[in-house]
């Protein structure tokens, strides 16, 4: 009786089951009643990343330095290669074809994640207390000056984008 | 036999431009990825460039990026470096190696060619 | 760029005396895709060109004695030779071969004592 499945690492072919290529190689020629699956190594800068049957290997991606990327990790005969973008860039999808200059979070807000070579600069509106006077891919939400603590008194109040002023107490009552 | 022959080393002024030969034989070249690798008199080793086995990937050492050229010629086993602007720094002897689809190493060098930049 | 530290420089040692050396690596060699660490180690004697000695950290090319041994992962390897022999006099490399650019140690030469 013919099997109509076929264990781990094999498949169903004319009625039998033949073993899978192994990562890193391609599939030749199926198996037979009398013969074994024949696979052969992927070539230079390609690659087959599971257990197979296909009959052509996959070409490792180009990090491509006029795209802004880098490599992050090499590519082998049993993985892609992965891209990364330099510095100051970050990769616009997730499978890392191009990269943009991340943003700058304007005045009136901080940074609150630094962006990396994968992901944007994420930003965040200052809260009452905090100001951001610059446009900055760096810089947090800084705290207002305190005049208390420097024997002053507000002058005029701060805002999200600018600081307080602090001036003399005035001493006329 | 894997045999891998480096010519075109030579003694050029600073500003000057050079091009290096890799001759392959005793394996099929069109197979396997190749390196430039460089070592300066006395010192260690530092990769240069890497070409893939069918021209599609090229990478370069910051280094050399903007002045130096790998290619190759896969009808006639060879692959080159083309160094343009060469400074002192570049004196070095310079190596070709190649990467196979398997190990992903360098497996087999050549024995070298001197470029020596100096006024 | 990964940066790559060979200690020590140099060490000078007795025939059938064990050597080791030390290659760490400012990040991690490991590719996540097929777990292994793509360390490399080359051998260069005295007016040769390198010759590859160990693949993968611890896979030795063919044709190498099995005096000579890899191991370590992550950031951290070691080049063992078990028993000194007068032909392994010679200037050893260790190398990232995980990203580019590739990157070498500063090489470590071993002598007879």
């Known amino acids: 009786e013919p099997p109509t499945a076929c264990r781990e690492k094999q498949y169903l072919i004319n009625s039998q089951c033949c073993s899978l290529c192994q990562p890193g190689q391609k599939l030749v020629s199926d198996c037979t009643e009398f013969t074994e699956t024949e696979c052969l190594p992927c070539s230079e800068s390609e690659f087959l990343d599971t257990w197979n049957r296909e009959t052509r290997c996959h070409q490792h991606k180009y990090c491509d330095p006029n795209l802004g990327l880098q490599v992050q990790q090499k590519g082998t005969s049993e993985t892609d290669t992965i891209c990364t973008c330099e510095e100051g860039l970050h990769c616009t999808s997730e499978s890392c074809e191009s990269c943009v200059p991340h943003r700058s979070c304007l005045p009136g807000f901080g940074v609150k994640q630094i962006a990396t070579g994968v992901s944007d600069t994420i930003c965040e509106p200052c809260p009452v207390g905090f100001f951001s006077n610059v446009s900055s891919a760096f810089e947090k939400c800084r705290p207002w000056t305190s005049c208390e603590t420097k024997d002053l008194v507000v002058q005029q109040a701060g805002t999200n984008k600018t600081d307080v002023v602090c001036g003399p107490q005035d001493r006329q009552r | 036999e894997v045999q891998l022959v480096e010519s075109g080393g030579g003694l050029v002024k600073p500003g000057g431009s050079l091009r290096l030969s890799c001759a392959a034989s005793?394996?099929?070249?069109?197979?396997?990825?190749m390196h430039w690798v460089r070592q300066a008199p006395g010192k260690g080793l530092e990769w240069v460039a890497y070409i893939s086995s069918g021209n599609r990937i090229i990478y370069y050492a910051d280094t050399v990026k903007g002045r130096f050229t790998i290619s190759r010629d896969n009808a006639k086993n060879s692959l080159y470096l083309q160094m343009n602007s060469l400074r002192a720094e570049d004196t070095a002897v310079y190596y070709c190696?190649?990467?196979?689809?398997?190990?992903?190493?360098?497996?087999?060098w050549g024995q070298g060619t001197l470029v020596t930049v100096s006024s | 760029d990964i940066v790559m530290t060979q200690s020590p420089d140099s060490l000078a040692v007795s025939l059938g005396e064990k050597v080791t050396i030390n290659c760490k690596s400012s990040q991690s060699l490991l590719n996540s895709g097929n777990q292994k660490n793509y360390l490399t180690w080359h051998q260069q004697k005295p007016g040769q060109p390198p010759k590859l000695l160990i693949y993968w950290t611890s896979t030795r090319e063919s044709g190498v004695p099995d005096r000579f041994s890899g191991s370590g992962s992550g950031t951290d390897f070691t080049l063992t030779i078990s028993s000194l022999q007068a032909e392994d006099v010679a200037v050893y490399y260790c190398q990232n071969d995980y990203t580019y650019p590739l990157t070498f140690g500063g090489g470590t030469k071993v002598e007879i004592k």
């Open positions: 005793g394996f099929t070249f069109s197979d396997y990825g």
């Open positions: 190696a190649r990467q196979d689809g398997y190990r992903y190493a360098m497996d087999y």
